[in-house]
């Protein structure tokens, strides 16, 4: 049934996150007269679109309309009809579409054209679909978590209104892991950002922020797995790949054509004497970790210090919120607790990867096998990326907070994106004193 218009003066906004593995629709709501206050926007709905990411629709663009229908209809139900025409809708596509565009601008354009046509059919104020840059993805993720944590509020509080809050205005760094890319964004401590491409300057609520960000395309968990398989099959003696990143007893056939479909595996491409190969899991964390490390080139650094692949990374500073797949994977593995040390995480990963596949399937009967089979790799990859890639240590591990939601809103780039596009983060501090979140919660 159609909702009746609310008596209070509220506004809504919709953002679709078109990721490499799936699309999610987020609905945000805020009091109209408090648009410039910090922390007043909150998420009222998340709708996960059934099916893969939009980049997989290249051969079936005619199905995109149907694919988006359920979640767009859900938005129609959630948002009062009287608000439909003034509710902005934004679609941001991330690394999956960046990779498709790298292969062919024509195919990427075609997918986005059909997406735009589909979204224009709804009664909302459609503002366009575009591929956002990796820099934007990192920046908006950082804005989202700090906005939700109340870090931009100038009012100091004696009480904590959100988890992870340390009663100071020092911002959190943002660690985002997707299927095709991963982003690291934070304010370094009095450190020059040596690479201009990685430097962002913001003025938010009257304060200046010099932010470091980098997006590692092809280093999302799914593309990292394709890279690892392409690297390892190069040295396989036959069409059997004994893989330590999968559980003992696990078997899966992979088409070589699928392996080389992505630009991420281009550097490992070679003519193989077979069209298919079989992954046979051997479940060894240490060997899996070693194999993953080979994806990170740490031998070359043209700066004072680097993450990997010659990319500048300043010394880590402060606390970090790790979200998206960092959170989903660690949550599945039951490793998100603040009390779990890095050594304990490693120990638990060793045990988990060594468990036989049949046992794993029984223990997690409700989980799709495709996802279930990859948690050993994904967990090991997260550890490798954070420790060897970004140089977290056993000591600094405690500064990483695995975050799913903050105050009921998902951590991710979408909220920051909407706040920016609707001009809801002022450069200067608003004249009226913002009320604390607790007024609205």
């Amino acid at each position: 049934t159609q909702n009746k218009a609310l008596p209070e003066n509220v506004k809504y906004g919709i953002v679709l996150d078109a990721g490499s593995s799936h699309t999610s629709l987020y609905i945000y709501k805020w009091p109209a007269e408090k648009e410039n206050d910090t922390g007043v926007v909150h998420q009222v709905e998340e709708c996960r679109v059934k099916g893969p990411g939009i980049s997989k629709f290249v051969q079936k663009v005619n199905e995109i309309g149907i694919y988006l229908t359920d979640c767009m209809e859900r938005a129609r139900e959630v948002i009062p009809r009287s608000q439909h025409q003034e509710t902005p809708v934004y679609l941001g596509a991330t690394a999956g579409m960046r990779l498709l565009r790298m292969e062919s601008e024509e195919l990427a354009d075609r997918v986005l054209d059909v997406v735009e046509r589909s979204l224009s059919n709804y009664p909302f104020d459609f503002q366009g679909a575009r591929i956002i840059t990796g820099q934007e993805e990192g920046a908006y993720g950082w804005i989202t978590i700090n906005y939700l944590l109340g870090k931009f509020s100038q009012k100091t509080r004696w009480f904590s209104i959100v988890p992870y809050e340390t009663n100071n205005q020092e911002t959190f760094g943002a660690l985002d892991l997707g299927g095709a890319s991963t982003q690291v964004t934070f304010v370094p401590q009095n450190q020059t950002i040596e690479s201009p491409d990685n430097a962002l300057q913001f003025r938010l609520y009257g304060k200046d922020y010099n932010v470091y960000t980098h997006s590692f395309l092809c280093y999302g968990k799914d593309q990292a797995l394709w890279q690892k398989l392409a690297k390892d099959i190069q040295v396989a003696s036959n069409e059997i790949l004994r893989d330590p990143c999968f559980h003992p007893g696990y078997k899966k056939v992979v088409n070589v054509s699928d392996l080389y479909k992505t630009p991420c595996t281009k550097r490992f491409e070679m003519t193989l004497p077979f069209q298919q190969f079989e992954i046979q899991g051997i479940g060894n964390y240490q060997q899996c970790h070693q194999s993953i490390l080979e994806l990170f080139n740490t031998s070359y650094c043209p700066y004072s210090q680097c993450a990997f692949n010659g990319i500048f990374l300043p010394p880590l500073q402060g606390d970090f919120g790790a979200f998206s797949a960092f959170y989903f994977v660690m949550k599945f593995l039951n490793l998100t607790s603040e009390k779990v040390s890095q050594e304990k995480v490693t120990e638990m990963m060793k045990k988990f990867c060594a468990q036989p596949w049949e046992e794993i399937k029984t223990s997690y009967a409700g989980v799709k096998e495709k996802y279930l089979s990859e948690y050993c790799f994904s967990g090991t990859y997260i550890l490798s990326l954070l420790l060897q890639g970004y140089h977290f240590t056993a000591d600094s591990w405690e500064h990483i907070h695995f975050i799913g939601k903050i105050q009921g809103s998902d951590a991710g780039w979408t909220l920051g994106y909407m706040l920016n596009l609707t001009n809801m983060i002022p450069a200067e501090q608003p004249l009226s004193t913002p009320l604390s979140h607790s007024t609205y919660v």
Partner: antibody
Framework: QVQLVQSGAEVKKPGASVKVSCKAS????????MHWVRQAPGQRLEWIGY????????TFNQKFKGRATITVDTSASTAYMELSSLRSEDTAVYYC?????????WGQGTLVTVSS | DIVMTQSPDSLAVSLGERATINCRAS??????????MYWFQQKPGQPPKLLIY???NQGSGVPDRFSGSGSGTDFTLTISSLQAEDVAVYYC?????????FGGGTKVEIK
């Protein structure tokens, strides 16, 4: 705005090698492939190959395989094309072009003259 | 390799008149509902400039008098009203498959 700036003209002897550079600006260098195309005097344009700056993987026109090498320095947002064992018929203007399948941006061209 | 054959080799058209250039591919350059066909304009001493992509879409900043049509193997570039600055060599190109190939070029002059 997107710009591709190539290195200057070169004169080489037969059998030598030449390395042409292409510095990119105005976009994220690793988000697009870089192609190399050449044009001999009065001839049609001829595609040499491309590189994925993201990871250094490359694909070549069979005609140039083994003789052409394409590399990148991502920290300098620069692509390079090296052609070895030069012969007189390699005298041409060499262009870099950004694109997946759409060559929307081109360098100004580098004239390579092979002469004894 | 896909061979791109352009016709005519050269073309002399009066100012304000229509110029039509054809390009035929030795096999279809269509894939996933997209024509991987492009038209470039090249003036002496300059790099090629993208006019048309995907057979019929205008490149950025390209005047409306340039249009492209066709699909599969047969394509046409049309200049609806020739201007003095349109004197150049025009090339077609396919990027459906490696090696990407170009047509031999059509020289457009003023009659």
């Amino acid at each position: 705005q997107v710009q591709l700036v190539q290195s200057g003209a070169e004169v080489k002897k037969p059998g030598a090698s030449v390395k042409v550079s292409c510095k990119a600006s105005g976009y994220t260098f690793t988000d697009y492939n870089m192609h190399w195309v050449r044009q001999a005097p009065g001839q049609r344009l001829e595609w040499i190959g491309y590189i994925v700056p993201l990871n250094g993987g490359s694909t070549f026109n069979q005609k140039f395989k083994g003789r052409a090498t394409i590399t990148v320095d991502t920290s300098a947002s620069t692509a390079y094309m090296e052609l070895s064992s030069l012969r007189s018929e390699d005298t041409a203007v060499y262009y870099c072009a950004r694109g997946g399948t759409r060559f929307a941006y081109w360098g100004q061209g580098t004239l390579v003259t092979v002469s004894s | 390799d896909i061979v791109m054959t352009q016709s005519p080799d050269s073309l002399a058209v009066s100012l304000g008149e229509r110029a039509t250039i054809n390009c035929r591919a030795s096999e279809s350059v269509d894939n996933f509902g997209v024509s991987f066909m492009y038209w470039f304009q090249q003036k002496p001493g300059q790099p090629p400039k993208l006019l048309i992509y995907g057979a019929s879409n205008q490149g950025s900043g390209v005047p409306d008098r340039f249009s492209g049509s066709g699909s599969g193997t047969d394509f046409t570039l049309t200049i609806s009203s020739l201007q003095a600055e349109d004197v150049a060599v025009y090339y077609c190109q396919q990027t459906k498959e490696v090696p990407y190939t170009f047509g031999g070029g059509t020289k457009v002059e003023i009659k």
